[in-house]
């Protein structure tokens, strides 16, 4: 979908402490040019997104995990 | 800049029906939520809905099932909000919300007035 | 639905004084020890703002004179010191579940 706008970095803040069972799924941005960074963008059960740390070791293992189930399916 | 921009204000007739937009800028809708919201002259905020563009899926306050329908079309960055069947209990100001957390923007609001 | 409660309706707090706003839920708003539970300003003619998302978390660019609090069913939010640009109609909203609800609102005058 072409979209006219610049876009940028989304996450300008990450959310802390959300746990993994409050999440539906993440979405994974890789660097480019509208962004330099990694960015993680979790999708919650309750009609919300929020931006999660990327270098955190609880969200690696949660895109670990989402990502294995997704090759599962 | 990252915002919200709603179309403007409408009257409209009873009985007939409304379509209001909000277009995003400076972020893409497919990954957020828009949420849409209404409020009364002098009366409190009101939950009418939310889809999730990335994939058309809606949810809806019971009391708007019928009343009110949200879409979105991600080529335009453009969520809508349509209201059929007009009456003056709808004469309100209607706000779609960015939902993120951490960064929640809102429109600027539109004011849709219900008179013959 | 979950029906919210705020208390009290409208207060009227001195400059630099603490204000307190209370937001009890029918039900709990929690899932897995996050609490859905969101605080937002309104000022005249102007959208809500977010303040407090997920009960204690602070939004982007919001002072640190506010903050929240709480978990399940009772909720607060503080102001403190309150300022004169504070002067506002705060409502509490969960999103724990569908449908989400708002509180009717509790409007901040400052003396």
């Known amino acids: 979908a072409s979209v006219a706008t610049e876009l940028r970095c989304q996450c300008l803040q990450t959310l802390q402490g959300i746990h993994p069972k409050n999440i539906q799924s993440v979405n994974v941005k890789s660097p480019g040019p509208h962004c330099a960074q990694t960015e993680v963008i979790a999708t919650l059960k309750n009609g919300r997104k929020a931006c999660l740390n990327p270098a955190s070791p609880i969200v690696k293992k949660i895109i670990e995990k989402m990502l294995n189930s997704d090759k599962s399916n | 800049e990252l915002q919200l921009q709603q179309s403007g204000a409408e009257l409209v007739k009873p009985g007939a029906s409304v379509k209001l937009s909000c277009t995003a800028s400076?972020?893409?809708?497919?990954?957020?939520?828009i949420h849409w919201v209404k409020q009364r002259p002098e009366q409190g905020l009101e939950w009418i809905g939310r889809?999730?563009?990335?994939?058309?899926?809606?949810k809806y306050d019971p009391k708007f099932q019928g009343k009110a329908t949200i879409t979105a079309d991600t080529s335009s960055n453009t969520a809508y909000l349509q209201l059929s069947s007009l009456t003056s209990e709808d004469t309100a100001v209607y706000y779609c919300?960015?939902?993120?957390?951490?960064?929640?923007?809102w429109g600027q609001g539109t004011l849709v007035t219900v008179s013959a | 639905n979950i029906v919210l409660t705020q208390s009290p309706a409208s207060l009227a707090v001195s400059l630099g004084q603490r204000a307190t706003i209370s937001c009890r839920a029918s039900?709990?708003?929690?899932?897995?020890?996050?609490?859905?539970m969101h605080w937002y300003q309104q000022k005249p003619g102007q959208p809500p703002k977010l303040l407090i998302y997920?009960?204690?978390n602070l939004e982007s660019g919001v002072p640190v004179r506010f903050s929240g609090s709480g978990s399940r069913t009772d909720f607060t939010l503080t102001i403190d010191p309150v300022e004169a640009d504070d002067a506002a109609t705060y409502y509490c909203?969960?999103?724990?579940?569908?449908?989400?609800?708002f509180g009717s609102g509790t409007k901040l005058e400052i003396k």
């Open positions: 919300e960015e939902g993120r957390y951490g960064v929640a923007y």
């Open positions: 400076g972020f893409n809708i497919e990954d957020t939520f």
């Open positions: 889809i999730d563009p990335a994939n058309g899926n809606t």
């Open positions: 039900e709990s708003v929690d899932s897995y020890g996050n609490s859905f």
């Open positions: 997920l009960a204690s």
């Open positions: 909203q969960q999103n724990n579940e569908d449908p989400f609800t």
